[in-house]
Interface confidence: low
């Protein structure tokens, strides 16, 4: 017996084929021995199968000798063994027909779980396998799961049925939801402006909900609300914003915060949280800022960082155009009686320099000035 | 070189708590991530609770509702406060610190949790 697979929703052609090649009369039944269709002649005429309405031939092929069943909008439960009567002959052919489906939603947000369920008709025992956009394979029965999916999950995933050395393939499209970056550092001197963008990581026709952006600085005992914000149809709207800091935030996407200066009291990490129309769960991005500042105090010249500095980075003094007067792996470093000239305070990480302050030393008898 | 030394560790009756210390040689606002890990014997190290920089926090499964991770940033220490504890909670319980621009995460040496029946 010959076995067909199919694909719930699609369209099967189950062939037929008599030695004449002319038009003859033939049947197609089900296994009930209930007749779908046949001909009279050169008329397509049906039988009171449930498959009425979805099932069709290809008259065009009749006067070859074959005499196709078409069946349209496949559902599991036309999972049979399907009988042509054609001459004196007697074709079966087995139709199994497979359904795979998401659960509930294809848009996941980031960490959470994708399963998959392969819907078959009783007495088969499929096995399955499915390919990520990343190319990760899992395996299954009829349910397989994926949990903490990441960024790199979306997109198209293949899905192979194998039944009976057949198979069958679904591509199921999964779009997860996420920022394009888990975190971010911003290195900025004391006064600049900072700019936080926070880009998504995928497109949607509309998006809609709401956010909030959190700030542990270091200095503080915990973390504070800097901002609240609406989202409505990817148009931005405050809700509420602290007076100190007093952020910006731009009308449109990206999400783009500004804050009119970097000051050591707000170094330190943000976590800026954003909650979906009909999702559950939340979108997280991480955000660092980290403050450099250079004085001069009598006869002392200071640098100093505050925020979340690893604790491999260097921070150095050193005259400009000349070696380094002192360098450590501290968040202040030094120099007593510095000579007259231009400093510079620089934050490098393997000696690539990440954020660098300049600042001039006068002859004693003057006062410092800051470029 | 950053340090983390972990407290607490014991035996403890089922349904008991106990409250976890790690301690650091440095500010914790330094660190991306500050969590808990956890290994019994004859077994792989899992993951039990994160909290991150900006104060986000994290559980596994096994321990929502149980677990509650917080910590003191006057002192840069983590706390891991455990109650309802059950025999499976055996393990010796580890202190980590993650550096987001650092391939390599910081741990502590350990604190011995056992929960008898």
């Known amino acids: 017996k010959k076995v067909v697979l199919g694909k719930k929703g699609d369209t099967v052609e189950l062939t037929c084929t008599a030695s004449q090649k002319k038009s003859i009369q033939f049947h197609w039944k089900n296994s009930n021995q209930i007749k779908i269709l046949g001909n009279q002649g050169s008329f397509l005429t049906k039988g009171p199968s449930k498959l009425n309405d979805r099932a069709d031939s290809r008259r065009s092929l009749w006067d070859q000798g074959n005499f196709p069943l078409i069946i349209k909008n496949l559902k599991i439960e036309d999972s049979d063994t399907y009988i042509c009567e054609v001459e004196d002959q007697k074709e079966e052919v087995q139709l199994l027909v497979f359904g795979l489906t998401a659960n509930s939603d294809t848009h996941l947000l980031q960490g959470q779980s994708l399963t998959l369920t392969l819907e078959s008709p009783p007495g088969s025992s499929p096995s399955v396998q499915c390919r990520s956009p990343r190319g990760k394979n899992i395996q299954g029965g009829k349910t397989l799961s994926v949990s903490q999916l990441e960024l790199q999950d979306s997109g198209t995933w293949t899905c192979t049925v194998l039944q009976n050395q057949k198979k069958v393939e679904f591509k199921i499209d999964i779009v997860v939801l996420a920022f394009q970056k888990a975190s971010s550092i911003v290195y900025k001197k004391e006064g600049e402006q900072v700019e936080f963008s926070f880009p998504l990581a995928f497109t949607v026709e509309k998006l809609t909900g709401s956010g909030e952006l959190w700030w542990q600085a270091e200095r503080a005992s915990s973390s504070k609300s800097w901002i609240t914000f609406d989202l409505k149809n990817k148009e931005v709207s405050v809700k509420r914003v602290t007076q100190d800091p007093k952020l910006q935030m731009g009308k449109k996407l990206p999400l783009h915060l500004t804050l009119p200066q970097a000051l050591p009291q707000y170094a330190g990490s943000g976590n800026l949280t954003l909650a979906l129309e009909a999702k559950t769960g939340k979108l997280h991005q991480e955000v660092n800022l980290v403050v450099m500042r250079a004085t001069q105090l009598q006869k002392n010249l200071t640098c100093e960082v505050w925020g979340p500095t690893s604790p491999k980075l260097m921070l150095s003094l050193k005259l400009e155009n000349k070696e380094a007067k002192v360098s450590k792996r501290e968040k202040a470093v030094w120099v007593l009686n510095p000579e007259a000239g231009m400093w510079q305070c620089l934050l490098s990480d393997s000696g690539q320099v990440l954020l660098e302050s300049n600042i001039k030393v006068l002859p004693t008898w003057s006062t410092p000035v800051q470029p | 070189e950053v340090q983390l030394v972990e407290s607490g560790g014991g035996l403890v009756q089922a349904g008991g708590s106990l409250k976890l210390s790690c301690a650091a040689s440095r500010s914790i606002l330094d660190f991306n991530a500050m969590g808990w890990y956890r290994q019994a014997p004859g077994k792989q190290r899992e993951w039990v609770t994160t909290?991150?920089?900006?104060?986000?926090?994290k559980y596994a499964d096994s321990v929502k509702g149980r677990f509650s991770i917080s910590r003191d940033n006057a002192k840069n220490t983590v706390y891991l406060q455990m109650s309802s504890l059950k025999p499976e909670d055996t393990a010796t319980y580890y202190c980590?610190?993650?550096?987001?621009?650092?391939?390599?995460?910081?741990w502590g040496q350990g604190t011995q949790v056992t929960v008898s029946s």
């Open positions: 980590n610190a993650r550096v987001f621009d650092l391939p390599n995460d910081y």
């Open positions: 909290i991150a920089r900006a104060g986000a926090t």
